[in-house]
């Protein structure tokens, strides 16, 4: 028996508007009905929780109102979007998946998605 496998892309480049999306897919060993997904950021030897949501299989993912994350779920796949990113937010974003109910509990952690964020250059003043 090993840890539950979680797959996510190795690299994602955020859009010029500071939005990054990636898929987090997990290999469920059982028939979970309640799943918790947490996005963690590791950078400069610090780990912070970016956002988290618990959802019932077949239902919509619900993050807190002030969360920078949104997402949808389909089967064992979660489509995550993080917004409001700036260059200083560049780092390794890790998908943590916990199968909460029914027992037994399982934990899986992805290998991380390196998200690169480049702040857009300010538009030069036009001489018209």
């Amino acid at each position: 028996c090993k840890a539950m496998h979680v797959a996510q892309p190795a690299v994602v480049l955020a859009s010029s508007r500071g939005i990054a999306s990636f898929v987090c897919e997990y290999a469920s060993p059982g028939k979970a009905t309640e799943v918790r997904v947490t996005v963690l950021r590791q950078a400069d030897s610090q780990v912070t929780e970016v956002c988290a949501a618990t959802y019932m299989m077949g239902n919509e993912l619900t993050f807190l109102d002030d969360s920078i994350c949104t997402g949808t779920s389909s089967g064992n796949q979660v489509n995550l979007t993080i917004q409001g990113l700036r260059a200083m937010d560049t780092g390794l974003y890790i998908c943590k998946v916990e199968l909460m109910y029914p027992p037994p509990y399982y934990l899986g952690i992805g290998n991380g998605t390196q998200i690169y964020v480049i702040d857009p250059e300010p538009c030069p003043d036009s001489d018209f």
Epitope: C1, I109, G112
Partner: nanobody, 127 residues
Framework: EVQLVESGGGLVQPGGSLRLSCAAS????????IGWFRQAPGKERETVSC??????SYADSVKGRFTISRDNSKNMVYLQMNSLRAEDTAVYYC??????????????????????WTQGTQVTVSS
Amino acid sequence: EVQLVESGGGLVQPGGSLRLSCAASGSTLDPFVIGWFRQAPGKERETVSCINRSRTSYADSVKGRFTISRDNSKNMVYLQMNSLRAEDTAVYYCAASPDKPFYTDQTMCNKHYYGYWTQGTQVTVSS
């Protein structure tokens, strides 16, 4: 799936020693980092120490006093606590995290990466 059960807590005088044990069932410990954490009343849960196949890490507050070890053949992890102080009084938890290539000495003990938490065992250091 992994199931963890810890034991070994109790009451000890300042300067004394205790050994906590964390027994795993349902899986080999090999692919996991095992961590010890503690929570004092009114405080956040904090990292004490953790161990994977080749590395150990300790919180600064316990370095030189606590020693973590693992016996994969018995599926056990131990926390030897020496020179105990009143400030070590807390509920101690054992937890597991899948070992990942991006873990560093500084991050592999981070509580955010852990699951399979035990119920906790009380350690009280008092004269």
